[in-house]
């Protein structure tokens, strides 16, 4: 029978299928930076090249040297999960092992950097097919380790990292916190976050998605035919590295941005019980469990988007938060969220030639998040149109005035500090299709894009009675690109996108003093790409 | 994901006291020193010196050599363990933490990070 983890990540229609590149050979190479490995195990024999790379600190004590098989345990198991004959995700994939962890599973940032540099050198000396680097390790936040991952990713290498097993915010660890890395948390057979003793999987905005990481059966280094089960975010990352290897075997030209977007888009949604995570992390943590996506040929030119949260701005009066998309992605909208509701809105600005999403804290606020909607829009030409705040009592309108440009998102930013004197912005699709509409003291920003066949529409949902949140979803075939909250009067916490759902949040205390006439409205901008069609606004 | 997390950054912007030697013109450090927030994971005595992105190959070697020379003048021996050329410009050194102020004032230095442990997950 198929082990639960493989059943979970490989849909039935993929089970028997062998992934091969168009020319018939599987050219993907996976580099594993881990302990030494037992290359003679039946699961991985003939698939693994054990490089002579070795950069590890000395072990504490000597007991490990006696039983060398224990030194190989972690790496052998992961190699088996990636490409094992029986229990592997990407059964045909060739794997190169670099030893950066000692017999006790400890390594150093410097050793890992030298390992990453070794891969880069190998790539320069002998260019090959697609490369996937598996980093089943974690240390404290390291600017240089993250920078090295960024540099390697920009050469076309796909890096997959363990989120960490500290039951903590993955952003506090490296390489998990590197944006250019696909960071993987761990779930169990019930699709719940993995608990490991008193700790467990890391979580938060730096995690891209989760994958099986509890009681995973794989190669044991103790004998050539032994299997053992291991748990952790390393195992989860190995599953995703295997999925990525299979995706690249079929379609070697997929970029990191495309791989990440497809992994997110085709993952299993909303099965994780978010109550396991700390309350302040629940909104930031993706409710996604990895599955092997179909090929792009089977799914057509879908518009793919993901939500990127910024770090928390901090509570100072002028604190700003910044969310960035990957270089290949288009920032189609920007919104903001504050748990206290004290925020001065959000806007898009260009920094160093890249559009970024900014959010501003308000006086007395505990801080804000900027929430970027990052999408893959082939041949897109996007621009931002903004209008300064209107005089008191007047509305501010911004629309996309360039021919064939469609509105993909709206942002609003208030100049005034005093939240009580202003009414919040509104986005009116019925009266003014394709326009962002703001109220007193709000600067309004419209994100306008032109791309072949891109069409968009606004979808609103309002609730008059007391409600902590209002949601509106884009229907099948449409992708959420923009999400805003349009309140009647009271304080809103902001809005953000969860997959294809626009969530508008209202302050708890605001519920009681809201009259039935003051509906809180969640407004979504839904877009789709129809390559044959002209860019258009759908009424 | 790119903001610095729970991370120690120390500005060691000490005014130069470089004995007035010709190649050690007054230079105030703008580079920063960083280390892991978890003390037990730190590896004091080993440092990754990260240079500005556009630093040329020869300049990396010169900077490492300059640090060795300046350290030697002060009676310290430092060991350059590795030079990074391909992913980023920099070098790995084993040296006394006493020399961090000196290292941060070297030209081309963007920041210095103390080495730290990583763990199998």
């Amino acid at each position: 029978s198929i082990p639960w983890n493989l059943e979970r990540i490989i849909p039935a229609w993929h089970q028997t299928e062998e992934d091969r590149s168009p020319d018939g050979s599987s050219q993907v190479e996976v580099y594993l930076l881990d302990t030494s490995i037992q290359g003679a195990h039946r699961e991985i024999e003939g698939r693994v090249t054990i490089t002579d790379f070795n950069s590890v600190p000395e072990e504490d004590g000597t007991r490990f040297h006696r039983q060398a098989s224990k030194c190989d345990s972690h790496g052998t198991h992961l190699a088996g999960v990636v490409s094992g004959r029986d229990a592997g995700v990407a059964k045909g994939t060739s794997l190169h092992s670099l030893r950066v962890l000692n017999c006790q599973g400890k390594g150093t940032v410097s050793g890992t950097l030298i390992g990453l540099e070794f891969i880069r050198k190998s790539q320069l000396i002998q260019p090959s097919g697609p490369l996937v680097v598996l980093l089943p390790l974690a240390g404290g936040y390291s600017r240089i380790l993250n920078a090295a991952c960024r540099h390697l990713a920009r050469t076309g290498v796909v890096l997959v990292a363990a989120a960490g097993n500290f039951r903590d915010d993955a952003c506090l660890y490296s390489p998990a916190s590197a944006p250019e890395v696909i960071t993987v948390g761990a779930t169990n057979a019930q699709d719940q976050p993995v608990t490991l003793g008193t700790l467990g999987t890391n979580f938060g905005r730096c995690v891209d998605l989760f994958a099986p990481g509890k009681d995973i059966i794989g190669a044991s280094s103790d004998c050539s035919t032994c299997f053992m089960s291991q748990s952790g975010t390393s195992q989860a990352a190995a599953h995703v590295a295997g999925i990525v290897a299979r995706m690249l075997s079929r379609e070697p030209t997929l970029t990191l941005a495309e791989l990440r977007q497809r992994l997110i888009h085709f993952s299993t949604k909303d099965v994780i019980n978010m109550a396991w995570f700390p309350e302040d992390q629940q909104v930031l943590t993706p409710n996604l469990v990895a599955t092997l996506p179909p090929s792009t040929h089977e799914t057509g030119g879908q518009l793919l988007c993901r939500t990127v949260w910024s770090a928390h701005s901090g509570p100072t009066r002028t604190a700003t938060a910044t969310a960035r998309c990957a270089p290949e992605e288009e920032l189609l909208s920007c919104s903001s969220f504050s748990r206290s509701g004290r925020r001065r809105g959000d806007w898009i600005e260009a920094i160093g030639g890249q559009q970024v999403c900014k959010a501003l804290n308000a006086f007395g606020g505990e801080g804000v998040y900027a929430v970027a909607r990052c999408c893959l829009v082939p041949r897109a030409n996007c621009s931002i149109h903004n209008t300064p705040a209107a005089r008191a009592g007047l509305e501010t309108h911004v629309h996309c005035h360039q021919k064939d440009h469609v509105l993909t998102g709206c942002s609003f930013h208030w100049e005034v500090e005093d939240l009580s004197v202003r009414r919040q912005p509104a986005l009116r699709s019925r009266r003014q299709p394709g326009q962002c509409v703001g109220h007193q003291a709000a600067s309004v920003y419209a994100s306008c894009c032109h791309a072949p066949g891109l069409e968009c529409k606004i979808k609103e949902h309002g609730i008059s009675g007391p409600s902590e949140q209002v949601t509106v979803a884009c229907e099948a075939g449409w992708t959420l690109t923009g999400c805003n909250v349009l309140p009647g009067a009271s304080l809103t916490l902001g809005a953000y996108s969860v997959d294809n759902l626009c969530v508008a949040r209202v302050h708890d205390t605001a519920r009681a003093d809201r009259t039935s006439g003051e509906a809180t409205v969640a407004a979504a901008i839904c877009c789709r790409s129809r390559p044959s069609a002209k860019a258009s606004w759908v009424q | 994901q790119d903001e610095d997390g729970d991370y120690e950054e120390l500005m060691l912007a000490l005014p130069s006291q470089e004995d007035g030697l010709a190649d050690e013109a007054a230079h105030v450090a703008t580079a920063t020193f960083r280390r892991c927030s978890k003390e037990a994971w730190r590896l004091p005595g080993t440092y990754i010196v990260v240079l500005m992105e556009e630093t040329q190959r020869l300049q990396i070697e010169q900077t490492a050599h300059r640090l060795q020379t300046r350290a030697a003048r002060r009676g310290y021996v430092i060991k350059v363990l590795h030079i990074f050329y391909d992913l980023f410009p920099g070098f790995l050194v084993k040296m006394s933490s006493d020399l961090l102020g000196l290292a941060l004032k070297l030209p081309h230095v963007e920041y210095i990070e103390e080495d730290s442990f990583v763990f199998a997950q």
Epitope: R66, S220, S224 | -
Partner: antibody, heavy 111, light 106 residues
């Protein structure tokens, strides 16, 4: 397929030595260690010693003085030698590596 | 040296029953424990490796669990072919076998 084949049964005189050869196939002795275990009549399994993949050895303290394990990697053979056998050393001797075991060698110590 | 105390030393059960055998180590063995089935005239057969991993070809009625010093092995829905002697072995530090449990059918 992994196999460990042991040399045939032997009758050993008291105070004499015992030699058993374990020939492995399906894996390399440079990759995995080989353990030796015995079962005396009516008793349980007893670990005797091991030769690790690198060639180093560890022995059960009770047998240390009279046991020697060596190997020839190129021939995929492990050699087990025990000296000064007594009647209570009568047992089935196995070479093993966790999942894969030899068929056993029956050793009888008798005058 | 690590000692392994296995209990019971013998066990009689009916077909279809669930039986459990325990092994206690003299110190923490970090889950490095195997469980073997041994039948007369044959070499021991590895059932479970590293505390709980069922080896390929072994029926799912066999299971293992534990951590630290305490480990257990169970057979649910006992079948006639399960008559054998069962051993635990720690391999955290070299190998040490438990005394064995002889399983008989009532």
């Amino acid at each position: 397929q992994v196999q460990l084949k042991q040399s045939g049964p032997s009758l050993v005189q008291p105070s004499q030595s015992l030699s058993i050869t374990c020939t492995v196939s399906g894996f390399s002795l440079t990759s995995y260690g080989v353990h030796w275990v015995r079962q005396s009549p009516g008793k349980g399994l007893e670990w005797l010693g091991v030769i690790w993949r690198g060639g180093s050895t560890d022995y059960n303290a009770a047998f240390m003085s009279r046991l020697s394990i060596t190997k020839d990697n190129s021939k995929s053979q492990v050699f087990f030698k025990m000296n000064s056998l007594q009647a209570d050393d009568t047992a089935i001797y196995y070479c093993a590596n966790h999942r894969d075991w030899g068929q056993g060698t029956l050793v009888t110590v008798s005058a | 040296d690590i000692q392994m105390t296995q209990s019971p030393s013998s066990l009689s059960a009916s077909l279809g029953d669930k039986v459990t055998i325990t092994c206690k180590a003299s110190q923490d063995i970090n889950k490095y424990i195997d469980w073997y089935q041994h039948k007369p005239g044959k070499g021991p057969r590895l059932l479970i490796h590293y505390t709980s991993t069922l080896q390929p070809g072994i029926p799912s009625r066999f299971s293992g669990s534990g951590s630290g010093r305490d480990y257990s092995f169970s057979i649910s829905n006992l079948e006639p072919e399960d008559i054998a002697t069962y051993y635990c072995v720690q391999y955290d530090d070299l190998w040490t076998f438990g005394g064995g449990t002889k399983l008989e059918i009532k």
